[in-house]
């Protein structure tokens, strides 16, 4: 069964800066990745970035530097201050559309005990939806 993992890390140098990494553990080819915060897209979340292997990448503030790390994992940085910047308990979700598995989504947030600069290991997060 495919799985999605989500890792959230607060940068030690910039307390309002977060790095989000997501990956897809499956054999299919990925056609689209959507990253959101505040919950899944369509369930109160806000799109932060959309990554397509051929059509490119779009990102919306406060997201910066959204990129493919491998063929099956992505990362992006969130930075900023004020109302549109993340806080420690913000939920981040990644949805991977792949063929032939379909769409798989998982969410994660900063571990409560983590210090700046530390993060939870990138273990699979609970799968919220498989379309």
């Amino acid at each position: 069964t495919p799985e999605v993992w989500v890792q959230v890390r607060m940068e030690a140098t910039e307390l309002s800066s977060f790095t989000i990494r997501c990956g897809f553990l499956g054999s299919g080819s990925i056609s689209l990745v959507t990253v959101s915060w505040g919950g899944p897209n369509g369930a109160g979340g806000t799109t932060l970035a959309v990554l397509h292997p051929e059509r490119g990448i779009r990102q919306w503030a406060p997201a910066r530097q959204a990129r493919w790390e491998t063929q099956s994992s992505i990362s992006l940085i969130l930075e900023g201050s004020g109302a549109s910047s993340p806080c420690a308990n913000t939920t981040f979700c990644c949805k991977f559309a792949s063929f032939p598995e379909g769409s798989w989504e998982a969410c994660g947030s900063l571990p409560p005990s983590s210090d700046p600069g530390l993060s939870a290991p990138p273990t699979p997060a609970p799968i919220l939806r498989a379309d």
């Epitope: 505040g38 919950g39 897209n41 806000t46 799109t47 059509r55 919306w60 503030a61 910066r64 549109s84």
Partner: antibody
């Protein structure tokens, strides 16, 4: 067919507030950012801010913070922009425009709403 | 904020000819530039995004190129309906428009 239909022209007095509407059709309203753009007479285009209708999350150009407030009514697929404490500097044409994501920014535009602020 | 300097601010060209408009960003915008056409009394129309990708339905006589901070937009085989104001727009971070170029076809 994507369509953004804006409310009609307005003549208001200085100091008043005004809410402009933008009714979206032909796509899933909650899935795309909706932006507002200002054009003063004889001048260029200025981005005011955006709203993501699915979550009602907003982001404003610093210049328009406190001047514009963006909201949506998901049940009617309508976006609104409230402009307050109006002055002659706010006299302009205001456009709503959809961000198409990977299809490009501002892929569909409303026809514009002309606002005249005059006593 | 990212600034865009668009030039020229106006130009006149002959029917069937070619024009080029340039846009310079205050920093690298990673090819996230779009070009719009605006005619009086109408909403603007997206022509090109991501430097050179034509929006559906836009004829191939419109083209764009560039990278880093420097970008250009061209129209060849000019037609009467190309008379309009053209804007560049960066969307690498937030959104900023260039000052516009008013094109007149002779």
């Amino acid at each position: 067919q994507v369509h953004l239909q804006q409310s009609g022209p307005e003549l208001v007095k200085p100091g008043a507030s005004l809410k402009i509407s933008c009714k979206a059709s032909g796509y899933t309203f909650t899935d795309y950012y909706l932006n507002w753009v200002k054009q003063r007479p004889g001048q260029g285009l200025e981005w005011i801010g955006w709203i993501f209708p699915g979550s009602e999350s907003t982001f404003y150009n610093e210049k328009f913070k406190g001047k514009a407030t963006l909201t949506v009514d998901k049940s009617s697929s309508t976006a609104y922009m409230l402009l307050n404490s109006l002055t002659s500097e706010d006299s302009a044409v205001y456009f709503c425009t959809r961000d198409g994501g990977l299809r490009g920014p501002f892929d569909y535009w409303g026809q514009g709403t002309t606002l005249t602020v005059s006593s | 904020d990212i600034q865009l300097t668009q030039s020229p601010s106006s130009l006149s060209a002959s029917l069937g000819g070619k024009v080029t408009i340039t846009c310079k960003a205050s920093q690298d915008i990673n090819k996230y530039i779009a070009w719009c056409q605006h005619k009086p009394g109408k909403g603007p129309r997206l022509l090109i995004h991501y430097t050179s990708t034509l929006h559906p339905g836009i004829p191939s006589r419109f083209s764009g190129s560039g990278s880093g901070r420097d970008y250009s937009f061209s129209i060849s085989n000019l037609e009467p309906e190309d008379s309009a104001t053209y804007y560049c727009l960066q969307y690498d971070y937030l959104l900023t428009f260039g000052g516009g170029t008013k094109l007149e076809i002779k």
